[in-house]
Interface confidence: low
């Protein structure tokens, strides 16, 4: 029998799969590649023509509890003279990640997967105006 | 693990840290947010450090499709539409968490996996190294 998976394609279920109650999934939160490190160019948030700052958000009922969000420093972009050029726009670049949310209902605890939109950094773009028909 | 304040009226058996294995609801909260960056904005074309988006598909992972950015140029696009090599297009990378099927092919058993993705590109002033 084919079993639907998260993401709408199908797999033949191997015999070795652990039993899981209906409507839920088993999740091991021991992270694979936990010690992987980002190897971005140094200080790009300050050297960018669309510079950004970082803010750390903390939630003890979320795993991971710490999520870093970027915020563009300017509406415009920084030109060669180091001045803000408002004919261009600094815009956020976003990426989805998954977190595990812990919910307390009375004395019982349940866990929920959640998609979180993280602002990763900013880029400089030419603006556009859309006219809706 | 993560320490949380415990409801004082609850029995002390509850672990303050996240357990290593949890049963989670199959419904993912905020599941229907845009996952295709080509559809959600055209920044990749309008940026002064434009990038191409490459589809990375893995059926053993959720989400099974992830888009990877690759900067189109070493330099940045100037006001005349030409590549200026006095500036650099560099990728913005981010660690994200995904679900990896464990054991493989199992429909409802996963492990969290951290992966590094390039989300887009930004234009930076280059670091010039002077050799003594």
């Amino acid at each position: 029998r084919k079993i639907p998976k998260v993401g709408h394609t199908f797999f033949q279920k191997p015999e070795s799969c652990p039993p899981v109650p209906g409507g839920s999934m088993k999740l091991d939160i021991g992270i694979i590649n936990e010690n992987q490190r980002v190897s971005m160019s140094r200080n790009i948030e300050s050297r960018s023509t669309s510079p950004w700052n970082y803010t750390v958000t903390w939630d003890p009922n979320r795993y991971p509890s710490e999520v870093v969000q970027a915020q563009c420093r300017n509406l415009g972009c920084i030109n060669a003279q180091g001045k803000e050029d408002i004919s261009m726009n600094s815009v956020p670049i976003q990426q989805e990640t998954l977190v595990v949310r812990r919910k307390h209902q009375g004395c019982s605890v349940s866990f929920q997967l959640e998609k979180v939109l993280v602002t990763v950094g900013c880029t400089c773009v030419t603006p556009v105006i859309h006219h809706v028909q | 693990g993560i320490t949380i304040p415990r409801n004082p009226g609850c029995p002390n058996s509850e672990d303050k840290n996240f357990p290593r294995t949890v049963m989670v609801n199959l419904n993912i909260h905020n599941r229907n947010t845009n996952t295709n960056p080509k559809r959600s904005s055209d920044y990749y074309n309008r940026s002064t450090s434009p990038w191409n988006l490459h589809r990375n598909e893995d059926p053993e992972r959720y989400p099974s499709v992830i888009w990877e950015a690759k900067c189109r140029h070493l330099g940045c696009i100037n006001a005349d539409g030409n590549v200026d090599y006095h500036m650099n297009s560099v990728p913005i990378q981010q660690e994200i968490l995904v679900l990896r099927r464990e054991p493989p092919h199992c429909p409802n058993s996963f492990r969290l996996e951290k992966i590094l993705v390039s989300v887009g590109c930004t234009c930076v002033t280059p670091i010039v190294h002077h050799v003594a």
Partner: nanobody, 122 residues
Framework: EVQLVESGGGLVQPGGSLRLSCAAS??????MGWLRQAPGKEREFVAA????????YYADSVKGRFTISRDNSGITMYLQMNSLRPEDTAVYYC?????????????????WGQGTLVTVSS
């Protein structure tokens, strides 16, 4: 959950101007919009601005007369309404949404303010 509070509505003569404000608090959004509902009519799209502030969208009926903008922080959105007409009379709502596709579809907005009444009459 995003909380939205509108202000700036009121009574104005035809040809006059008003500036509406909408203060947002809470989680991020992809777009913020102004929608309006005239007495006995369906709610309709007026204008929207992307969360980054660089993309703006207007309904044909207000193009050239209304300008949508937001502050640097993205917390407050504005609608500058010039050359107002009696047919602009409505309750104006501020709302947020995820995604930039079909911003003119009022059903796609998730969080709504309580609305502010704009009356254009001589």
């Amino acid at each position: 959950e995003v909380q939205l509070v509108e202000s700036g509505g009121g009574l104005v003569q035809p040809g006059g101007s008003l500036r509406l404000s909408c203060a947002a608090s809470g989680r991020t959004y992809d777009a913020m919009g102004w929608l309006r509902q005239a007495p006995g009519k369906e709610r309709e799209f007026v204008a929207a601005i992307s969360g980054s502030g660089d993309d703006t969208y207007y309904a044909d009926s207000v193009k050239g007369r209304f300008t949508i903008s937001r502050d640097n922080s993205g917390i407050t959105m504005y609608l500058q309404m010039n050359s107002l007409r009696p047919e602009d009379t409505a309750v104006y709502y501020c709302a947020t949404r995820r995604g930039l596709y079909y911003v003119w579809d009022s059903n796609d907005y998730e969080n709504w303010g309580q609305g502010t009444l704009v009356t254009v009459s001589s």
